[in-house]
């Protein structure tokens, strides 16, 4: 996601499962810290946003032709799992220790 | 990158190494097809944008709170190498068959 002014970084995003309709099958937790990647991918791309070569190229082309080519985008580059208690197909409460890809571990410019 | 109206997809982006100042060390090719990921990550996220669970969650939160949380972003999810002839540290023209991460192979919503 983009954000005015600040550079690409991980910010808080608390998600309530009721808000997204997932409370129908996720029993617990009621909410969790998903985090969000926010901020711009500005030249020069710093090491901490682990840019790919393509992101570096796109950033340089954007510098030269800002109206033609967009900046690279600040996105999750590494995700972490959370533990959930959910209803299985039979409606039985089941604990899944590692429900993958739910929380941002790292952000970067891509 | 984002794009008004159209959904996340791979579009052409021809990059001239002179435009980004890399012609000082890349001898050939003079330009190449880098591609760019353009378009929006709209609800519901289609399978072809290979959304992560976090991207799906963020999309749902954005639907509920559009001013608070951004949409997922359309970015390269798989990159390909290109062959380059470059000047090594001694200035000797050297062929690198696979200079990784230079061209978009696939785009997705992250």
């Amino acid at each position: 996601s983009t954000g005015a002014g600040s550079h690409c970084q991980k910010t808080s995003l608390r998600v309530n499962f009721e808000d997204i309709g997932w409370n129908s099958w996720i029993i617990a937790p009621k909410e969790y810290e998903a985090y969000e990647c926010k901020g711009g991918c500005f030249f020069p791309l710093a090491d901490d946003v682990t840019p790919t070569k393509h992101a570096i190229v796109q950033t340089l082309v954007h510098l030269k032709f800002p109206t033609k080519v967009g900046k690279a985008c600040c996105v999750p580059t590494k995700l972490s799992p959370i533990s959930i208690l959910y209803k299985d197909d039979m409606g039985v409460p089941t604990l899944k220790y590692h429900y993958e890809g739910m929380s941002v571990a790292e952000c970067g410019c891509r | 990158s984002t794009g008004a109206g159209s959904h996340c997809q791979k579009t052409s982006l021809r990059v001239n190494f002179e435009d980004i100042g890399w012609n000082s060390w890349i001898i050939a090719p003079k330009e190449y097809e880098a591609y760019e990921c353009k378009g929006g990550c709209f609800f519901p996220l289609a399978d072809d944008v290979t959304p992560t669970k976090h991207a799906i969650v963020q999309t749902l939160v954005h639907l509920k709170f559009p001013t608070k949380v951004g949409k997922a972003c359309c970015v390269p999810t798989k990159l390909s190498p290109i062959s380059i002839l470059y000047k090594d540290d001694m200035g000797v023209p050297t062929l690198k068959y696979h200079y990784e991460g230079m061209s978009v192979a696939e785009c997705g919503c992250r």
Partner: antibody, heavy 120, light 109 residues
Framework: EVQLVQSGAEVKKPGESLKISCKGS????????IGWVRQMPGKGLEWMGI????????TYSPSFQGQVTISADKSISTAYLQWSSLKASDTAMYYC?????????????WGQGTLVTVSS | QSVLTQPPSVSGAPGQRVTISCSGS????????VSWYQQLPGTAPKLLIY???KRPSGVPDRFSGSKSGTSASLAITGLQAEDEADYYC?????????FGGGTKLTVLG
């Protein structure tokens, strides 16, 4: 339609010189690598070297370095392979091939081959 | 002696699945991509697979490539009489391109 057309078969004597050609058409000749591959009778493929016609940059296999010269004339979209002094062991089929645009290590179009026979 | 090692010959009956192996080292296959070529008798080689597992347009999906560590393999399913040919693997080693010695595929009558 992409085509690589090679010059005809040659019969030469040991010690003679030779230059065979490979003419590209149907694509931008200067921006694709052209490789040369040898195939001795009944044997496998051997990579000889490669050239980027735009600047005539070449890279040779260590086995062929100094034995042959690879060149190109971009004005007529033609690549060349030449010997200054042929040996009987140079008897083989020689193929030119075009490297894929972004991947010079994969040859997507091939010439029909030029058979070179060196015999006294 | 080729840098990449292939079996001299393999065979299979029509409709069967055959695989051709290609063994190298960390400096070639281990660190780089693999291509496969088919050479029908009396003709120039044809690119079948590039970048380990990608097929150029026009190559049937009966042909597939894979790579693991310092080895690669070509699989041909639903073997047909017209698949009888020599098959070569290739990879890169620094600035150089290297071929396997070739494998003759015989389709049993």
């Amino acid at each position: 339609e992409v085509q690589l057309v090679q010059s005809g078969a040659e019969v030469k004597k040991p010690g003679e010189s030779l230059k065979i050609s490979c003419k590209g058409s149907g694509y931008s000749f200067t921006t694709y690598w052209i490789g040369w591959v040898r195939q001795m009778p009944g044997k496998g493929l051997e990579w000889m070297g490669i050239i980027y016609p735009e600047g005539s940059y070449t890279t040779y296999s260590p086995s062929f370095q100094g034995q042959v010269t690879i060149s190109a004339d971009k004005s007529i979209s033609t690549a060349y392979l030449q010997w200054s002094s042929l040996k009987a062991s140079d008897t083989a089929m020689y193929y030119c091939a075009r490297g894929k645009r972004v991947d010079a290590s994969s040859f997507d179009y091939w010439g029909q081959g030029t058979l070179v026979t060196v015999s006294s | 002696q080729s840098v990449l090692t292939q079996p001299p010959s393999v065979s299979g009956a029509p409709g069967q699945r055959v695989t051709i192996s290609c063994s190298g080292s960390s400096s070639n296959i281990g660190d780089n991509y693999v291509s496969w070529y088919q050479q029908l008798p009396g003709t120039a080689p044809k690119l079948l697979i590039y970048r380990n597992n990608k097929r150029p347009s026009g190559v049937p999906d009966r042909f597939s490539g894979s790579k693991s560590g310092t080895s690669a393999s070509l699989a041909i399913t639903g073997l047909q009489a017209e698949d009888e040919a020599d098959y070569y693997c290739s990879s890169t080693d620094k600035e150089h391109l290297v071929f396997g010695g070739g494998t003759k595929l015989t389709v049993l009558g």
